[in-house]
Amino acid sequence: MAVTACQGLGFVVSLIGIAGIIAATCMDQWSTQDLYNNPVTAVFNYQGLWRSCVRESSGFTECRGYFTLLGLPAMLQAVRALMIVGIVLGAIGLLVSIFALKCIRIGSMEDSAKANMTLTSGIMFIVSGLCAIAGVSVFANMLVTNFWMSTANMYTGMGGMVQTVQTRYTFGAALFVGWVAGGLTLIGGVMMCIACRGLAPEETNYKAVSYHASGHSVAYKPGGFKASTGFGSNTKNKKIYDGGARTEDEVQSYPSKHDYV
């Protein structure tokens, strides 16, 4: 019962998390104009992964897509990639976990198979959550870097009479949505992995005992229902997850400008 609850809760938490990752990826408010130096502006700028927008006080909002692929900062491309990988892995994980749910019966699927599927989906959720957290964190780091760079620029060369206020950007709502969603997906994945242990029938580690029947002897070896680590194979001690997944995007240089309109 506890296993079913853990598995079900893990599924629901992951579902909410992946929905959040999708929402964050689609949102336009990844970075929003910092109003600290100009709180009385009648024009408000905000940017997402796919387009930048301007909202006027009049209510008129204009959004322009980033119609170039090569002209965008490498870090933005990396963030896009991480979020998409997170969504794809999460979606596959959800699909696998639906069939792995203990409360759903599909043909004569054994518990061992369900355990494997639960573990697989759990790992997928963990990686999906990590991708989202990494993507959002990379973007946040890029914002912080550019924020201080533009702050330094603001206070240099202001000796003239004309004042030019450089637009600075700070954390947008999508970052917080992404962090929370990534965290939820991660938690859901861990719960699925925990549930997997309960789903797999315990292997009793008794020594083989010989029973002597009249006439001839037959040896019975208990513990034949060991949970398999693959969907079809029953290979023992097979390592299916390294846990040391590393993206190529970790060694990217920061763009000199964040304003990629």
């Epitope: 009648a42 024009v43 700028n45 301007v54 006080s57 009049s58 209510g59 008129f60 206020v165 637009t167």
Partner: antibody, heavy 117, light 113 residues
Framework: QVQLKESGPGLVAPSQSLSITCTVS????????VSWIRQPPGKGLEWLGV???????YYNSALKSRLIISKDNSKSQVFLKMNSLQTDDTAIYYC???????????WGQGTTLTVSS | DIVMTQSPSSLTVTAGEKVTMSCKSS????????????LTWYQQKPGQPPKLLIC???TRESGVPDRFTGSGSGTEFTLTISSVQAEDLAVYYC?????????FGSGTKLEIK
């Protein structure tokens, strides 16, 4: 079609307060902002303040302490209240509707206010 | 507050002539988010309320004759009338629509000989 019409007292004694109403038609006050602008006789335009569709207000820094702009969406009316009037507040008072670019695309004909004892 | 400075304060021209008037702001009115300048030009004919001519520094309002052209960016803007007509007799105002308060320039009075 879009129309704005200002109505005011016409004559007000110094140190008294003023209330002008702008009645609009052809658009909703929940969707568009309305600004108040005045023009003293023979002089230029002076922006007084704005009330946006969401209800947020911004005022001319020099007149902020004396001004209140409010509205009644259901009656399609915008109100300008100004206290401690002086003779230099004598002007034509206009209300104008905002559109994209934060510019004012429609203006009322204006109401003349004279501050005199 | 942003200070808007218009020059000249008045000009007298003959019909058919090209006219240029200037508007300068104390701060940049350029928004990097949409690459637009939040400067508006109004025309006020005698005894009438102002009329919107140009917004975003160069976008002509519908119904405005194409002889009116707005240009400039950042802090320096220009309104050009390519061939002045008798009906263009008016005062022309520029306005900052970028940050509060939405200040107006003092105006340029256009007179026809």
């Amino acid at each position: 079609q879009v129309q704005l019409k200002e109505s005011g007292p016409g004559l007000v004694a110094p140190s008294q307060s003023l209330s002008i109403t702008c009645t609009v038609s052809g658009f909703s006050l929940t969707d568009y902002g309305v600004s108040w602008i005045r023009q003293p006789p023979g002089k230029g335009l002076e922006w007084l303040g704005v009330i946006w569709g969401g209800g947020s207000t911004y005022y001319n820094s020099a007149l902020k302490s004396r001004l209140i702009i409010s509205k009644d969406n259901s009656k399609s009316q915008v109100f300008l209240k100004m206290n401690s009037l002086q003779t230099d507040d004598t002007a034509i008072y206009y209300c104008a509707k905002h559109h994209y670019g934060n510019a004012c695309d429609y203006w009322g004909q204006g109401t003349t206010l004279t501050v005199s004892s | 507050d942003i200070v808007m400075t218009q020059s000249p304060s008045s000009l007298t021209v003959t019909a058919g002539e090209k006219v240029t008037m200037s508007c300068k702001s104390s701060q940049s009115l350029f928004n990097s988010g949409n690459l637009k300048n939040y400067l508006t030009w109004y025309q006020q004919k005698p005894g009438q309320p102002p009329k919107l001519l140009i917004c975003w520094a160069s976008t002509r309002e519908s119904g405005v004759p194409d002889r009116f052209t707005g240009s400039g960016s950042g802090t320096e803007f220009t309104l050009t009338i390519s061939s002045v007509q008798a009906e263009d007799l008016a005062v022309y105002y520029c306005q900052n629509d970028y940050s509060y308060p939405f200040t107006f320039g003092s105006g340029t009075k256009l007179e026809i000989k």
